[in-house]
């Protein structure tokens, strides 16, 4: 028969002939040949490879590097890499979580509309009218201006997006 | 550790039969076809027959073919050559080998078959 | 059938001496799957290169292989005392039958 130019799904054209590739978790140590099925070996502590494939060498895990501010969020098998994430107050770079910067913080005029996470920075936004933030924060979002009329007083100092309103008595002597 | 281990080899006088059995440890037999592979004394070696991982395809040398069989039980990890109508120049040191792309990565220690009569 | 011829049937050397054999085939061997093996007296062979050119597992790198087509080689850098045996090349790409070269003695001279 006429040797194959195309193989099924799973494997793979060496020399005129389909051998299977290795499952994943699994490295290739040798082509099949017309009596043998293709050698495969697991791949060792820390290693891993996470597609069917012809690789003579597993991938080693991602190493989350504590002076980097990284973490292990979940450890790795040998089908599936290490996914890193950033310690507590820190998020990741890239989508590959190679390194973590600090949680920007939101200036004033400024409050979180989303707090950060391992692999996402703060997002803020501009307090708008009505409300405030006096602080730099990571945290605090803009807050109400206070409500002088339910305190029975009065504006006496208008707020600003960094300011509340200061209230005041209510002036007694009215014409 | 990986290992073959040929057996049933002897004197048998010509025109009869002898069966050597190669038994394997170490690695998934089930995987792997084997060959046999012999050595007449003093001489170079020659190629005798292989079998698939499964059995199912055999392929024999021109001088062996019609007379030596080769099987396989995966169960008990076991190789076999079946020798029949035995001639003179069947004696040889019969190695079993393990079949690979790389070619033939393990073999036995061998069995001596004499056939005098 | 691909007949292999291999050559010197004997090589007398020394110790520390380059030895250099040649297996030459009758037709060209398909994707180079030519091996090399090693056998001493009362010993099973080994296999030393396979694929005409890449180390078996375990076998010293004084050990090369080379060639391609019809003409192969075995070298081995600095003979040590442990490698005078006999040698044999074996093609695996064009069978029944698997051929094997006539063999070529290494002896100490």
């Known amino acids: 028969p006429e040797p194959p130019t195309a193989c099924r799904e799973k494997q793979y054209l060496i020399n005129s002939q389909c051998c299977s590739l290795c499952q994943p978790g699994q490295k290739l140590v040798s082509d099949c040949t017309e009596f043998t099925e293709t050698e495969c070996l697991p791949c060792g502590e820390s290693e891993f490879l996470d597609t069917w494939n012809r690789e003579t060498h597993c991938h080693q895990h991602k190493y989350c590097d504590p002076n980097l501010g990284l973490r292990v969020q979940q450890k790795g098998t040998s089908e599936t890499d290490t996914i890193c994430t950033c310690e507590e107050g820190w998020h990741c770079t890239s989508e590959a979580c190679e390194s973590c910067v600090l949680h920007r913080s939101c200036s004033p005029g400024f409050g979180v509309k989303q707090i950060a996470t391992g692999v996402s920075d703060t997002i803020c936004e501009p307090c708008p009218v009505g409300f405030f933030s006096n602080v730099s924060s990571a945290f605090e979002k803009c807050h109400p201006w206070t409500s002088c009329e339910t305190k029975d007083l009065v504006v006496q100092q208008a707020g600003t997006n960094k300011t509340d309103v200061v209230c005041g008595p209510q002036d007694r002597l009215r014409a | 550790q990986v290992q073959l281990v040929e057996s049933g080899g002897g004197v048998v006088q010509p025109g009869r039969s002898l069966r050597l059995s190669c038994a394997a440890s170490?690695?998934?037999?089930?995987?792997?076809?084997m060959h046999w592979v012999r050595q007449a004394p003093g001489k170079g070696l020659e190629w005798v027959a292989v079998?698939?991982?499964?059995?199912?395809?055999?392929y024999y040398a021109d001088s062996v073919k019609g007379r030596f069989t080769i099987s396989r039980d995966n169960s008990k990890n076991t190789l076999y050559l079946q020798m029949n109508s035995l001639r003179a120049e069947d004696t040889a040191v019969y190695y079993c080998?393990?079949?690979?792309?790389?070619?033939?990565?393990?073999w036995g220690q061998g069995t001596m078959v004499t056939v005098s009569s | 059938e691909i007949v292999l011829t291999q050559s010197p049937g004997t090589l007398s050397l020394s110790p520390g001496e380059r030895a250099t054999l040649s297996c030459r085939a009758s037709?060209?061997?398909?994707?180079?799957?030519l091996a090399w093996y090693q056998q001493k007296p009362g010993q099973a062979p080994r296999l030393l290169i396979y694929?005409?050119?890449s180390l078996a597992t375990g076998i010293p790198d004084r050990f090369s292989g080379s060639g391609s087509g019809t003409d192969f080689t075995l070298t081995i850098s600095r003979l040590e005392p442990e490698d005078f045996a006999v040698y044999y090349c074996?093609?695996?790409?064009?069978?029944?039958?698997?051929?094997f070269g006539g063999g070529t003695k290494v002896e100490i001279k």
């Open positions: 694929g005409a050119s």
């Open positions: 079998i698939s991982y499964e059995g199912t395809k055999k």
């Open positions: 170490g690695f998934t037999f089930e995987k792997y076809g």
């Open positions: 037709q060209s061997v398909s994707y180079s799957y």
């Open positions: 080998a393990r079949d690979t792309s790389r070619g033939h990565d393990i």
């Open positions: 074996q093609q695996y790409s064009d069978y029944p039958p698997f051929t």
